[in-house]
Interface confidence: medium
């Protein structure tokens, strides 16, 4: 069954989850008693076309409601779990009262007031962020939307819209809240290897362990297919078949200028003479291409103590 929720003493209007594009009449029942819900508007809870209206809602209205669409050859039944909550005492809106999160980016963005199209509402819609009324000119309420100019991370938070539903000469309040998060516009660039340097030679001691880091940056945010890896003599380390040489999987890092970078470390447990004749390639690749920095190992010259 689908779920809907509302707040005590506010209007709540829900639709039959089975309705699709059906034009056939819809009947509503209290699921537990099978008692039919009337269509007369003088009742606090009544049916109007495919909609069930709670004007206003009470906590005791919570429960499962059944709707039946009667067509000549088939009856379709839908179930709706309705929960009416007491108004939260503080400004912290619990998760169960939140509608889907809106993700914003770029210069302008809009937040839509959830469920508003079910109601007979009139402009303007009032908007609040973390319970404070929005009065800056950057925030513009238009129809069922809130437009935010020059969005920044500071605009993240819980946005509540409040509007009035008019029925039979009476006005009812409706409020709905959703979170707004700002996604930073990322950029992708051709990989840049920051370590090791191009055509680098590294000094090692025979019999001692050695480790070489391959680090590369790929831009900021939204990277696809970004990888750093080592190859030995043009063969990936896992296939090289030398247990002494292992690759430690890429770590995510952030560089000083806030770019997204990856590091993979090549570890040799005990360097042998044979290792000095191998070619070690640090590879960085993403969607756009690949760059290779080749390094060689050289025996460390003993320090002359004469």
């Amino acid at each position: 069954s689908k779920s809907s929720w509302g707040l005590e003493n506010e209007a709540l209007i829900v639709r039959c989850p089975q309705r699709g594009r059906s034009t056939y009449p819809v009947e509503w029942y209290y699921s537990d008693t099978n008692e039919s819900i009337p269509t007369q508007k003088r009742n606090r809870i009544f049916v109007s076309r495919d909609r069930l209206k709670f004007l206003p809602a009470r906590v005791e209205d919570s429960g499962i409601y059944a709707c039946v669409i009667r067509s000549p050859n088939l009856n379709k039944t839908g179930y709706l779990n309705v929960t009416i909550h007491k108004k939260p005492p503080s400004c912290n809106i619990p998760d169960y009262l939140m509608y889907s999160t809106v993700r914003g980016s770029d210069k302008n963005f809009k937040i839509t007031c959830p469920t508003i199209d079910l109601y007979n509402w009139t402009a303007p819609v009032q908007w609040f962020k973390n319970c404070k009324a929005l009065q800056e000119p950057r925030f513009r309420a238009h129809r069922s939307y809130l437009f935010i100019d020059n969005v920044t991370h500071d605009d993240e938070g819980d946005y509540t819209c409040q509007f009035t539903h008019a029925e039979n000469g009476t006005n009812y309040i409706v409020t709905a809240t959703r979170s707004f998060t700002v996604e930073e516009k990322g950029f992708s660039m051709f990989p840049v290897i920051t370590n090791p340097p191009y055509n680098h030679t590294m000094e090692v001691e025979i019999g001692k362990p050695a480790s070489i880091a391959c680090s590369a940056c790929f831009g900021k945010g939204s990277h696809f297919l970004a990888d750093v890896l080592w190859q030995i003599n043009k063969t990936v380390v896992g296939n090289f078949g030398e247990a002494r040489i292992q690759e430690e999987e890429g770590r995510n890092e952030s560089s000083s200028n806030d770019m997204d970078c990856l590091t993979s470390v090549l570890r040799i447990t005990g360097v042998t003479e044979k290792d000095l004749s191998l070619e070690y390639d640090c590879l960085a690749l993403n969607l756009h291409g690949m760059i290779r920095h080749t390094i060689r190992l050289r025996r460390k010259q003993p320090i002359d103590h004469r």
Epitope: F190, L225, D227, L229, K234, L287, H288, G289, I291
Partner: antibody
């Protein structure tokens, strides 16, 4: 010569999974991206996803996110594309295609472009 | 997603005549890091996989006849067949490789008039 050979046609029931293989030969498997593209009957080309066989990283089209898994077995130079929770609209020819690479010697850059070698295609039919 | 739009949907050209197919991307596919347009053209004949003709918008793939040429930059691209041959009857697709998801145009069917 460079070749991609795909597994044979499959007939599947809705809700089941299919795993298509693509065996590469004639080049170093780990040096090139491998894409998967599908084509429904009488329709255009739709990109499914891509893998870097060397590093193992993958990226999928949003449409298939959560239903598709692309893997690569370096030891056999074979790429795989597995699609789960099949529905009738997944009926299509599935192609593997190698990502082209242009080498620039000045900086050891390898620029990726298009899809230069394609498999023969695997027909997947989803029908109850 | 970058949307690729080809025009026309189909094209009938006499043998030996020029055929021109246009492709427009919803945003630029020119990658500033290497000043290359990440755009490719493919030819697909019935019952066959697509075949790469052009990459970087204007570089001909090896083995492709020189009657095929690509041009354009940024968002507007053109594939030209300078002198249509019988074997060129196919569907042609443009494709951007600039960002994920990789996207193709809807295809242009080239026939002989």
């Amino acid at each position: 010569q460079v070749q991609l050979v795909q597994s044979g046609a499959e007939v599947k029931k809705p809700g089941s999974s299919v795993k298509v293989s693509c065996k590469a030969s004639g080049y170093t498997f780990t040096d090139y991206q491998m894409h998967w593209v599908r084509q429904a009957p009488g329709q255009g080309l739709e990109w499914v996803g891509v893998i870097n066989p060397g590093g193992g990283s993958t990226t999928y089209a949003q449409t298939f996110q959560g239903r598709v898994t692309i893997t690569a077995d370096e030891s056999t130079s074979t790429a795989y594309m597995e699609l789960s929770s099949l529905r009738s609209e997944d009926t299509a020819v599935y192609y593997c295609a190698r990502g082209g690479v242009e080498y620039s010697s000045s900086w050891d850059y390898y620029y990726y472009y298009g899809m230069d070698v394609w498999g023969q295609g695997t027909t997947v039919t989803v029908s109850s | 997603d970058i949307v690729m739009t080809q025009s026309p949907d189909s094209l009938a050209v006499s043998l030996g005549e020029r055929a021109t197919i246009n492709c427009k991307s919803s945003q630029s596919v020119l990658y500033r890091s290497n000043n290359k347009n990440y755009l490719a053209w493919y030819q697909q004949k019935p019952g066959q996989p697509p075949k790469l003709l052009i990459y970087w918008a204007s570089t001909r793939e090896s083995g492709v006849p020189d009657r095929f040429s690509g041009s354009g930059s940024g968002t507007d691209f053109t594939l030209t067949i300078s002198s249509l041959q019988a074997e060129d009857v196919a569907v042609y697709y443009c494709q951007q490789y600039y960002s994920i998801p990789v996207t193709f145009g809807q295809g242009t069917k080239v026939e002989i008039k």
